[in-house]
Each structure stands twice: as C-alpha cells, then as structure tokens.
Interface confidence: low
C-alpha cells in the first residue's frame, strides 16, 4: 500500500480508500471576524439589477441551506425607477464546495462536491448581434 | 446523546472526536456539467460596476486559488461611459467553505473553514444621510 510520511501528530487513516478519503474536522473556523455582519444584505434591493433570494435546502448536503439569487428583471432600473431594457440584469455565479452525505443518510461520511450558485446580479451592457 | 439512524453501509467512526470529525471522499463530484463555461467571465468588463479579479493563492488551502473581485470605481458607469458618482459600485460577497490542512502538513487531516470572498460588483443607489 501507500506509506505516508507525516507529522507525528497526524491522525492515522486505516480506511481502505485512503488517500481518497480524509478526516475533516467540522468545527468550522470562521475567518470573517472583522466583516460587517450586514455585508451585502441590502444590496439586493438597492441595486440597479435587483434580485430575490431563494432558499435551496437539502438535508443531505452541508451546508444544508444555500441562498440562490434570481434577478428580478431582464433589464436594469434606471434613474427614474423604471426598467430599462437597453441594459441587462445578469446573475454573478460562483463555484463553491459543499459536502454531500455519501452513502446517503450516513452521519459521518461525505463526498466533496462542486456546485454553481448565483450570488447576486449586476447590470451589463448587452451584446448586440447585428444581422446583415 | 443523539442517536442517528444510519444506512447500514455507512463507514464506522472510531475517532474520539466523532461526530466533529468525519470522513470525506476527495474525488470531487462536479454538478456543473450543463453550465455555460463562459458563465460570468466577461461580466466584469461589461458591468456598469466593473471589477478586476485578483488571484488569492494559498497552497495550504483547498481550493488553493480563489479569485477576488475588486470594484474598479467608487461610482458606476453611465450611458456615456463616464463614472457617475451619484451611484456606488459595491462588492457582492459570499461566505464559502474551504479545506485547511490541520495539523499543518498532515496529508489526511483537514478542518473546514469559512472565508468571505467578493464575487463581483453591483451598482447600488447610495444611502444618503441628511444632516439636520
């Protein structure tokens, strides 16, 4: 098998799938201590490309709740408060890591998974295709 | 304590820190197969609140490379292509999960960590405080 040199304080892994399977401590260390707790919380309403937040819940996933942004309009809000369809509201997406229970319903066994989430919306100039 | 009904095929955990420590399979399952690979790639330039992407690299973290958005202007770009300071470009932030090696240099032991990243920028109406 594979013999691994390690820090003497490393946990041992007797799992037959090692090294594909590792130990992960779920006591989350939060590096965001100095951030404003309000953060982007009101931007979804004040943006010229406002969005609604939809709750995506999956008990077999960690985190089990993820908030998905859906742009409210195809266009953007202009200075008069009306929707300007010469501009486009588009979602800003990001790939994030989540943990998925595998096999399902196992309390202590997960697989890393990448999912794409929409975090918010931004207003962009449309790409116009001219027909000859 | 809490009794968790589990799938009979679940791996057992003899770890004394269980259930804080779990097994995670690192063969990442990517759920984004049907997404447009271009995704938000050109929005950073076309947005009325454009942003630059800065590479944040940390080899002791997974993912080791994270791209951070920094808004280019305090204001937003208007229809004439000029910066309008009556509006504000603001970062849309999201808390994401990453894995950090712990103890350092252990090949099979990690801790989940939450970090706050700026994914892109959006244009918002400023909050104006009127002085009496």
């Amino acid at each position: 098998g594979i013999t691994i040199p390690r820090n003497p304080g490393c946990p041992n892994s007797e799992d037959k799938n090692f090294p594909r399977t590792v130990m992960v401590n779920l006591n989350i260390h939060n590096r965001n201590t100095n951030t404003n707790p309000k953060r982007s919380s009101d931007y979804y309403n004040r943006s010229t490309s406002p969005w609604n937040l939809h709750r995506n819940e999956d008990p077999e996933r960690y985190p089990s709740v993820i908030w998905e942004a859906k742009c409210r309009h195809l266009g953007c809000i202009n200075a008069d408060g009306n929707v300007d369809y010469h501009m486009n509201s588009v979602p800003i997406q990001q790939e994030i890591l989540v943990l998925r229970r595998e096999p399902p319903h196992c309390p202590n066994s997960f697989r890393l998974e990448k999912i794409l989430v929409s975090v918010g919306c931004t207003c962009v100039t449309p790409i116009v295709h001219h027909v000859a | 304590g809490i009794t968790i009904p589990r799938n009979p095929g679940c791996p057992n955990s003899e770890d004394k820190n269980f259930p804080r420590t779990v097994m995670v399979n690192l063969n990442i399952h990517n759920r984004n197969t049907n997404t447009n690979p271009k995704r938000s790639s050109d929005y950073y330039n076309r947005s009325t609140s454009p942003w630059n992407l800065h590479r944040n690299e940390d080899p002791e973290r997974y993912p080791s490379v994270i791209w951070e958005a920094k808004c280019r202007h305090l204001g937003c770009i208007n229809a004439d292509g000029n910066v309008d300071y009556h509006m504000n470009s603001v970062p849309i932030q999201q808390e994401i999960l990453v894995l950090r090696r712990e103890p350092p240099h252990c090949p099979n032991s990690f801790r989940l960590e939450k970090i706050l990243v700026s994914v892109g920028c959006t244009c918002v109406t400023p909050i104006v405080h009127h002085v009496a």
Partner: nanobody, 119 residues
Framework: EVQLVESGGGLVQPGGSLRLSCAAS????????MYWVRQAPGKGLEWVAS????????YYVDSVKGRFTISRDNAKNSLFLQMNSLRAEDTAVYYC????????????WGQGTLVTVSS
C-alpha cells in the same frame, strides 16, 4: 506552463549513493510544498519525502529515514533528493511532484527518473 523535470537516476550498487534533482518552472516554486514519490515495478505509488515551502520541515517515509535527505533551492526553483545507503528495495521510478492541498492528487508530475539498485 508548469514543468517538472527530474534527473540523476541510474544504476547503482547496494550501499551506493545518488542525488536526484528536479527543475521546476511555470509556477511560484517557493509557495508550494514539494514531494518525491516513487513507484517500484508492479507496485503502487509510495510517497517518499516532502519538504515545506521554506525548507524548514521535512517528512520521510519510515523506510528511508536516516538514508535519504530532501532539500530545495528556492532561488533556483530546484528540488533535490540525496539517497545514501541504497538498497534493492529502493529500485523505482522517482517522481517529483508539486503539492496542492490534496497532495496525492498532484496536479503536476515530472516524467520520472529511474533508479536501479542492483549488484
């Protein structure tokens, strides 16, 4: 483009020595933990040694402790493995690998250099 090029392998008698080198390019070498990994004929991969970014800490598989020394020269983007008191069981292809957070999912490998220990 990331490149890792190993050299220094060859045929050596039991008890002999070899020094393997790995020239790295295309990434910030000093930011990454680096590894030597080997694969003996018909066997799986075995992690031999690893070294911290600044060279301050080294780790070895038990079977090579006291015989092998891993080192690096960040100024020259180079990784080394000094192998002394070689044994027949050290015969393998030796690979240098760039370490990511998940070290056995190396994103980049060299082409390897063959070390044969035989009388």
């Amino acid at each position: 483009e990331v490149q890792l090029v190993e050299s220094g392998g060859g045929l050596v008698q039991p008890g002999g020595s070899l020094r393997l080198s790995c020239a790295a390019s295309g990434f910030t070498f000093s930011s990454y933990q680096m590894y030597w990994v080997r694969q003996a004929p018909g066997k799986g991969l075995e992690w031999v040694a690893s070294i911290k970014q600044d060279g301050s800490e080294e780790y070895y598989v038990d079977s090579v402790k006291g015989r092998f020394t891993i080192s690096r020269d960040n100024a020259k983007n180079s990784l080394f493995l000094q192998m002394n008191s070689l044994r027949a069981e050290d015969t393998a292809v030796y690979y240098c690998a760039k370490g990511e957070i998940l070290p056995l999912y190396f994103d980049y490998w060299g082409q390897g250099t063959l070390v044969t220990v035989s009388s």
